[in-house]
């Protein structure tokens, strides 16, 4: 699986999850998030050669098409597969609120 | 929606579904598929600016991050959203077989 366990331990050029730390205030301008200051959102990148963690029949077909037609601009793209939520603390006036934001952390990638 | 109805009618530079005809024999080397000869598989391409058909909170965050950090390599990617099946005819020896291959035709795209 193209997950953090594999990708963070290997120098993988092809599609894999990459570490990306996002600081809410500095990187997004989100001053309203009080906790955490930032988090590892991570991201997916890298080429998708034929059959590499193909998401659908279409991505398999497109991967083969791209292999046999290297000049073609059509190819699968490395995108998130499994995502996890992130719990944040913010304030509404003087009232603290805790919310779980879904699909915030990329744990693995796929070729789609 | 970034679907064929919209994308095929507009000159859209950003993430959209694009027409792609694949000939089974010539483009994939699949001699075993007898009908159809080929089909419009289509593909997704184009930049994913902030908030453009964002698939998850992560892609929204990543889009914003990319907007505020243009030098960053991390950005959402334009990938298939809705896919349709394709019915094919092939032969096993002298016995015809009809099979519906799932997720073969891209009908719309998203930024993931």
């Amino acid at each position: 699986a193209l997950d953090t366990n594999y990708c963070f331990r290997n120098l993988e050029e092809n599609c894999c999850v990459r570490p990306l730390y996002i600081d809410f205030r500095q990187d997004l301008g989100w001053k309203w998030v009080h906790e955490p200051k930032g988090y590892y959102a991570n991201f997916c990148s890298g080429p998708c050669p034929y059959l590499r963690s193909a998401d659908t029949t279409h991505s398999t077909v497109l991967g083969l098409y791209n292999t046999l037609n290297p000049e073609a601009s059509a190819s699968p793209c490395c995108v998130p597969q499994d995502l996890e939520p992130l719990t944040i603390l913010y304030y509404v006036g003087r009232t603290p609120k805790v919310e779980q934001l879904s699909n915030m952390v990329v744990k693995s990638c796929k070729c789609s | 929606a970034l679907d064929t109805n919209y994308c095929f009618r507009n000159l859209e530079e950003n993430c959209c579904v694009r027409p792609l005809y694949i000939d089974f024999r010539q483009d994939l080397g699949w001699k075993w598929v007898h009908e159809p000869k080929g089909y419009y598989a289509n593909f997704c391409s184009g930049p994913c600016p902030y908030l453009r058909s964002a698939d998850t909170t992560h892609s929204t965050v990543l889009g914003l991050y990319n907007t505020l950090n243009p030098e960053a390599s991390a950005s959402p990617c334009c990938v298939p959203q809705d896919l349709e099946p394709l019915t094919i005819l092939y032969y096993v020896g002298r016995t015809p077989k009809v099979e519906q291959l799932s997720n073969m035709v891209v009908k719309s795209c998203k930024c993931s």
Partner: antibody
């Protein structure tokens, strides 16, 4: 260009044997099923024998009229298909065509070889 | 086995005529939307030639005056304007199941 060249036909006495050959070129012989189709004088086309590719275990078919007398075989290394005809009868007199069916239709045909069974 | 019955068994026509040949199968030769019926032209002393595959698809190099239609058990070969070189015997053939069989043929003669 696809070419199918039959040979081995001729005059043979009833009860005798003949071996027809069909040398193929211009296509991926190994991938496709090969057949022998005949036309007897004044009659229509009849599929006599058929052999599919190695992928499908060289499965063979014979029409009832030739079963247990004719044997179809192929040599993929030589791109050649054979029809061994034993215990020949007068009703086997016909032009025998070698043909290839990549799918459900017989797309390419040889020019045919005449087999005459007569005393 | 699936039997194919062609009609008529022979016909006389003139150059320029529209000719229709039918082929009826003893059971359906269609599977899903695919119609597994094919048509051939055969002239004396020559190899048979594929005209139409899967009911309505024109084989490579075949003039557009030839067309095919039908589904299920009933199929038609049409020559829109008969040419001198079209006088021959025409056969249908199915590939719905093994064994594949041919129809009895339709001989098209000059009137």
């Amino acid at each position: 260009e696809v070419q199918l060249l039959e040979s081995g036909g001729g005059l043979v006495q009833p009860g005798g044997s003949l071996r027809l050959s069909c040398a193929a070129s211009g296509f991926d012989f190994n991938s496709y099923g090969m057949s022998w189709v005949r036309q007897a004088p004044g009659k229509g086309l009849e599929l006599v024998a058929d052999i599919v590719s190695k992928t499908y275990n060289y499965t063979t078919y014979y029409s009832d009229s030739v079963k247990d007398r004719f044997t179809i075989s192929r040599d993929d290394s030589k791109s050649t298909v054979y029809l061994q005809m034993n215990s020949l009868r007068a009703e086997d007199t016909a032009v025998y065509y070698c043909t290839v069916a990549p799918g459900g239709s017989f797309d390419y045909w040889g020019q045919g070889t005449l087999v005459t069974v007569s005393s | 086995d699936i039997q194919l019955t062609q009609s008529p068994s022979s016909l006389s026509a003139s150059v320029g005529d529209r000719v229709t040949i039918t082929c009826r199968a003893s059971q359906s030769v269609s599977i899903s939307r695919f119609n597994l019926m094919h048509w051939y032209q055969h002239k004396p002393g020559k190899a048979p030639k594929l005209l139409i595959y899967r009911a309505s698809n024109l084989a490579s190099g075949i003039p557009s005056r030839f067309s095919g239609s039908g589904s299920g058990t009933d199929f038609t070969l049409t020559i829109s304007s008969l040419q001198p070189e079209d006088f021959a015997t025409y056969y249908c053939q199915h590939s719905r199941e093994s064994p594949w069989t041919f129809g009895g043929g339709t001989k098209v003669e000059i009137k």
